[in-house]
């Protein structure tokens, strides 16, 4: 039969031969012949492949370095890589999740819309008329002013979208 | 910071069973494989075989397939080796060395060791 | 599995002088490690992934290697690097040591 040009899914292509990949987790150590299957063996400690293929190393997994602010989120295994995340209060700079920023603060007059996970930067949003934010944060949202009407008090200074109003007791009328 | 902590040393008759413990402190030992090596007297090391705490999932050297057994509670972050039908080759100092993926260094830290003496 | 063999078994060395250890293993490994142990104590890692030096390590000390064959080299030998070190690989299991290399001082 004529020697194949192209091989099935799992397969490579080698000396006019398909021989099978090796599944995720196992390193090629002798492509197939005629008389003989491929032979693949486990990669070692701290190494993975996640593919079915013909690599002749495993990788190594990753470090997560505490230096850039990383930490484990899953170790390593023959068939995956490490899977970093950040340290409280930081967030990934990339999606591989190489290095980590601080959390950014919303700046007075602007609260937290979403607050920040280990892979998302704090989302900020403008206060809206009707609220302030008096402080720098990274979980705070924005407060309503208070209601002064409420306290059975007035406003005596209007509030902004950074002070909340201030309120003050009612002017009597003399009599 | 992290570290090892192993049980103390046992004296124990041929035929019997003995149950070594190997504490970690300073991680979480599911993010780590924990390691078992031999030392007999003034001889090398030896790998026995190691666990995945996240799942039991265990390996050993052939060699001690049926010798020994490496169990972990991680409610208390500590592994076990147990070691069955013991015999004077089962006399050496026992280590316990995690491969901790928060460290740079695989192996960098290890158990003081714990010795095991078989004799009648 | 794949077999370490270490040479020489013993060595010893003058305080200055520089030392190689070298590792053979039966089958190609991707990397090695070194630990280096005295009397009474547990090991320490010394050279991880072929030739990076573990924490606190001197920088006299140096490693190389690929494949089948790998070496631990002390560019200039001082008292305290008298020691028994072993070469060990995580490429394939079950895990496998070198019968250690017993450095001496002269």
């Known amino acids: 039969p004529e020697p194949p040009t192209a091989c099935r899914e799992k397969q490579y292509l080698i000396n006019s031969q398909c021989c099978s990949l090796c599944q995720p987790g196992q390193k090629l150590v002798s492509d197939c012949t005629e008389f003989t299957e491929t032979e693949c063996l486990p990669c070692g400690e701290s190494e993975f492949l996640d593919t079915w293929n013909r690599e002749t190393h495993c990788h190594q997994h990753k470090y997560c370095d505490p230096n850039l602010g990383l930490r484990v989120q899953q170790k390593g295994t023959s068939e995956t890589d490490t899977i970093c995340t950040c340290e409280e209060g930081w967030h990934c700079t990339s999606e591989a999740c190489e290095s980590c920023v601080l959390h950014r603060s919303c700046s007075p007059g602007f609260g937290v819309k979403q607050i920040a996970t280990g892979v998302s930067d704090t989302i900020c949003e403008p206060c809206p008329v009707g609220f302030f934010s008096n402080v720098s944060s990274a979980f705070e949202k924005c407060h309503p002013w208070t209601s002064c009407e409420t306290k059975d008090l007035v406003v005596q200074q209007a509030g902004t979208n950074k002070t909340d109003v201030v309120c003050g007791p009612q002017d009597r009328l003399r009599a | 910071e992290v570290h090892v902590k192993q049980s103390g040393a046992e004296l124990v008759k041929p035929g019997a069973s003995v149950k070594l413990s190997c504490t970690a402190s300073?991680?979480?030992?599911?993010?780590?494989?924990m390691h078992w090596v031999k030392q007999r007297p003034e001889q090398g090391l030896e790998w026995i075989g190691r666990?995945?705490?996240?799942?039991?999932?265990?390996k050993y050297d052939p060699k001690f397939q049926g010798k020994a057994s490496i169990t972990t509670d991680t409610s208390s972050n500590t592994a076990y080796l147990q070691l069955s039908s013991l015999t004077s080759e089962d006399t050496a100092v026992y280590y316990c060395?995690?491969?901790?993926?928060?460290?740079?260094?695989?192996?960098?830290?290890w158990g003081q060791g714990t010795t095991v003496t078989v004799s009648s | 599995d794949i077999v370490l063999t270490q040479s020489p078994a013993i060595m010893s060395a003058s305080p200055g002088e520089k030392v190689s250890i070298t590792c053979s293993a039966s089958?190609?490994?991707?990397?090695m490690h070194w630990f280096q142990q005295k009397p009474g104590t547990s090991p320490k890692l010394w050279i991880y992934?072929?030739?990076n030096l573990a924490s606190g390590v001197p920088a006299r000390f140096s490693g190389s290697g690929s494949g089948t064959s790998y070496s631990l080299t002390i560019s200039r030998m001082e008292a305290d690097d008298a020691a028994t070190y072993y070469c060990?690989?995580?490429?394939?299991?079950?895990?496998?040591f070198g019968a250690g290399t017993k450095l001496e001082l002269k």
């Open positions: 060395t995690p491969n901790y993926y928060g460290s740079r260094y695989p192996f960098a830290y």
């Open positions: 992934s072929t030739s």
């Open positions: 089958s190609s490994v991707s990397y």
């Open positions: 666990i995945d705490p996240a799942n039991g999932n265990t």
């Open positions: 300073g991680f979480n030992i599911k993010d780590a494989y």
């Open positions: 060990q690989q995580g490429s394939s299991y079950p895990l496998t």
